[in-house]
């Protein structure tokens, strides 16, 4: 029964290969891999990329084999294929393998980066949508602003990322985000760098509210100068004729 | 969307041999299994065998003498072919099809009649 | 071959009558799969995998069991619903399927 690690292209149909409690999981959990056929078999093999044998066997004359990984280290993470058998194959025939499962054993997931769409500046009245990008699908993600203890957002994503919308009056502050697996056993994240959101160019209202005064100042004086040249004018059309300025 | 419709000849005498073809529509054979079922008149379903997507068959060991499945992917089409009919042959012939790794049927054709009489 | 026999084979139920009919296997299996056939027309998949329930199909049908014996049950019994039953596995070779449960609007 030694075989190639990815057996060679068969015309029988290829199983399903799951992983109970999940496929990202921390050092020390019991994982079970549960290989499908379509049909029942009578061999099942779990299959690791370039080793030459099956890594494990299972005999069950059934649809179903179940593979025990017993407090699974990281060094039993990585790709995982499952193929079966039939008795009436002939020797050595295997079924096209399942579709790859990656095996994730880790105590915290890599640190996701936090950006803010379009940009961190908000104008008045915007809306800002931040991105919390991590590396694996399926993942629940969770947002946090600075000074608030409860997480302000959550979001189950299928995608690597997660979308969280702030509205535009309250988007100003600090925030963080980290991201963890949807289910027990929960595997953390570490937290993203802080982002900060701010209002456009918060410099610039002050700079208009000075303009402001200065153009106020401004219409005074022409104001001024305007009633002035008036009275000037009216005083000289009162003059006695002969005298002139 | 997925369809499945039986075609055959309705009457046979004893003896002779069937014929029931299976003509689908959206889904290629080369990507999904198609098994054959019979319903004699008022009973139960029997299960035949099997064609799939990779040219490989399974038969119902009780009826394996007498049964041979065969397709032609570019004509999406599957063929029961069954030998030395009795009259307990007679029923209503289903082909369905079975999407994916979960061992039961996803759709059904509407079935062809088969009557093995003299 | 895995032999699954249907209790009962005929029953009757009023409207918004809670109705559990039983598929029990000679040995055991890992997963029922359930098909309703209306008279005259091809069975259509009704539940799989001993639980779930097939696209379209009410929420007041349930499935549940496991080893060698399943059941699909009714909350409550609709004039719809009326049908023959069958269970089927394929835990072993042949596949199989029960004999039927036919449930008739009384």
């Known amino acids: 029964d030694i075989t190639p690690s990815v057996p060679p292209a068969s015309y029988h149909p290829k199983p399903w290969l799951g992983a109970q409690p999940a496929t990202v999981v921390t050092p020390g959990v019991n994982v079970t891999l549960r290989c499908r056929a379509p049909q029942p078999a009578w061999r099942f093999g779990l299959f690791k990329p370039g080793e030459i044998a099956p890594l494990l066997f299972r005999d069950v004359s059934s649809e179903l084999a179940e593979f025990f990984l017993e407090e699974v280290t990281p060094a039993q993470g990585g790709s995982y294929r499952c193929c079966y058998r039939r008795p009436d194959w002939g020797p050595g025939v295997w079924s096209q393998p399942s579709d790859v499962l990656e095996l994730l054993v880790t105590e915290e997931l890599p640190r996701p980066s936090l950006v803010a769409l379009p940009g961190p500046v908000v104008g008045p009245g915007a809306n800002v949508s931040l991105r919390c990008a991590g590396r694996l699908r399926n993942m629940s993600f969770v947002l946090y602003r600075e000074g608030v203890a409860a997480p302000l957002q959550y979001r189950h994503s299928a995608q690597p990322w997660a979308d969280f919308t702030l509205l535009g009056a309250r988007a100003p502050g600090t925030y963080s985000c980290y991201y963890h697996t949807p289910s027990a056993p929960y595997v953390l994240s570490q937290r993203s760098e802080v982002l900060v959101i701010s209002w456009e160019d918060s410099g610039s209202s002050d700079y208009t509210r000075g303009n402001l005064v200065r153009l106020g100042l401004a219409g005074l004086v022409l104001i001024s100068l305007g009633a002035l040249v008036t009275f000037d004018w009216r005083s000289q059309n009162r003059a006695p004729a002969g005298i002139r300025p | 969307q997925v369809q499945l419709k039986e075609s055959g000849p309705g009457l046979v005498a004893p003896s002779q041999s069937l014929s029931i073809t299976c003509s689908v529509s959206?889904?290629?054979?080369?990507?999904?299994?198609v098994h054959w079922v019979r319903q004699p008149p008022g009973k139960g379903l029997e299960w035949l065998g099997v064609?799939?997507?990779?040219?490989?068959?399974n038969y119902n060991s009780a009826l394996m003498s007498r049964l041979s499945i065969s397709k032609d992917n570019s004509k999406s089409q599957v063929f029961l072919k069954m030998n030395s009919l009795q009259t307990d042959d007679s029923a209503m012939y289903y082909c369905?099809?079975?999407?994916?790794?979960?061992?039961?049927?996803?759709?059904w054709g509407q079935g062809t009649t088969l009557t093995v009489s003299s | 071959q895995i032999v699954l026999t249907q209790s009962p084979a005929i029953m009757s139920a009023s409207p918004g009558e809670k109705v559990t009919m039983t598929c029990s296997a000679s040995?055991?299996?890992?997963?029922m799969h359930w098909y309703q056939q209306k008279s005259g027309t091809s069975p259509k998949r009704w539940i799989y995998?001993?639980?779930n329930l097939a696209s379209g199909v009410p929420t007041r049908f349930s499935g549940s069991g496991s080893g060698t014996s399943y059941s699909l049950t009714i909350s409550s019994m609709e004039a719809e619903d009326a049908a023959t039953y069958y269970c089927?596995?394929?835990?072993?070779?042949?596949?199989?399927f029960g004999a039927g449960t036919k449930l008739e609007l009384k």
């Open positions: 369905a099809l079975q999407k994916g790794y979960g061992n039961y049927f996803d759709y």
């Open positions: 959206g889904f290629s054979l080369t990507s999904y299994g």
């Open positions: 064609m799939w997507a990779g040219g490989s068959t």
């Open positions: 040995s055991s299996v890992n997963y």
């Open positions: 995998d001993t639980s």
């Open positions: 089927q596995q394929w835990s072993s070779d042949p596949l199989t």
